[in-house]
Amino acid sequence: MMTGTIETTGNISAEKGGSIILQCHLSSTTAQVTQVNWEQQDQLLAICNADLGWHISPSFKDRVAPGPGLGLTLQSLTVNDTGEYFCIYHTYPDGTYTGRIFLEVLESSVAEHGARFQIP
């Protein structure tokens, strides 16, 4: 039975041109994490495999950095980066868990003065 839950940073915002860390955490299970995939809609950003290390999609290699941990750092953000991101945890023996993060990339002036989503 799958007992685990994915905790994510939820809804987050960041400034255009800046960077953001996407983080998920799997809890309430003793299952072994074998691989984590990071996807934007249906597009693969990166894979972190427990045995093989990181695969960063060539399309994003110039502005995606692995980590910290199983997370992913997006750099040189553009407004087009706004949208849903998914962390897909492959585990043994549980199977697959998926978490969702919504990122809003704001124009610098808006980001400076506007409300931000905060993670408690």
């Epitope: 693969l44 495999n49 060539p58 492959h90 043994y92």
Partner: antibody, heavy 119, light 107 residues
């Protein structure tokens, strides 16, 4: 056009080392990981390891870990695989292969380099 | 290590035949399986990755299916250029391992 051009055939004595090169062209070298795979005569394929040309970080098959070193030269867009303490069982064709867009498979392969280990 | 078996190890077929090759894996690899074609004296060529996605430039007569531990490569109508050896490979853990191969030759 993506091309991986490997160095020529080598004949080595048992106990020696061999270094095979793989020159990449037709794409941004640092954006794609590189794998090395070998194939003994009449046998199947055996994965040796992979490297990130950007960072130089590598992962190896435990079977070869103490004997293989994979490196890159970013300036010349060339990957290298060095295998030490050669024995007759290392006689094989050695391939470099570019990692694909969506994971740890290989989408383009070099032409292969034959390494013969014989006394 | 993840073990890979292929069946059959060899088969004889005629041009126009439908050919199916099976790859069985020792543990769940989800859909992280690739298929390669190799002709004598040549390098392997990628056909399929992620179990069912056709690589660029590969004819549509090739198709892949399966997930978990059981996978198949199907050639819907065998062509003269398809006579070769086919290998499956998981792309899920270290070491990446290949199946022993299936040789497809002319009947």
């Amino acid at each position: 056009e993506v091309q991986l051009v490997q160095s020529g055939a080598e004949v080595k004595k048992p106990g020696a080392s061999v270094k095979v090169s793989c020159k990449a062209s037709g794409y941004t070298f640092t954006n794609y990981y590189m794998h090395w795979v070998r194939q003994a005569p009449g046998q199947g394929l055996e994965w040796m390891g992979r490297i990130d040309p950007d960072s130089g970080g590598s992962k190896y098959n435990e079977k070869f870990k103490s004997r293989v070193t994979i490196t890159v030269d970013k300036l010349s867009s060339t990957a290298y695989m060095e295998l030490s303490s050669l024995r007759s069982e290392d006689t094989a064709v050695y391939y470099c292969a570019r990692e694909g867009h969506y994971g740890f498979y290989s989408d383009y392969w070099g032409q292969g380099t034959t390494v013969t280990v014989s006394s | 290590d993840i073990q890979m078996t292929q069946s059959p190890s060899s088969l004889s077929a005629s041009v126009g035949d439908r050919v199916t090759i099976t790859c069985r894996v020792s543990e769940n690899i989800y859909s992280y399986l690739a298929w390669y074609q190799q002709k004598p004296g040549k390098s392997p060529k990628l056909l399929v990755y992620n179990a069912k996605t056709l690589a660029e430039g590969v004819p549509s007569r090739f198709s892949g299916s399966g997930s978990g531990t059981d996978f198949t490569l199907t050639i819907s109508s065998l062509q003269p250029e398809d006579f070769a050896t086919y290998y499956c490979q998981h792309h899920y853990g270290n070491p990446l391992t290949f199946g022993p191969g299936t040789k497809v030759d002319i009947k």
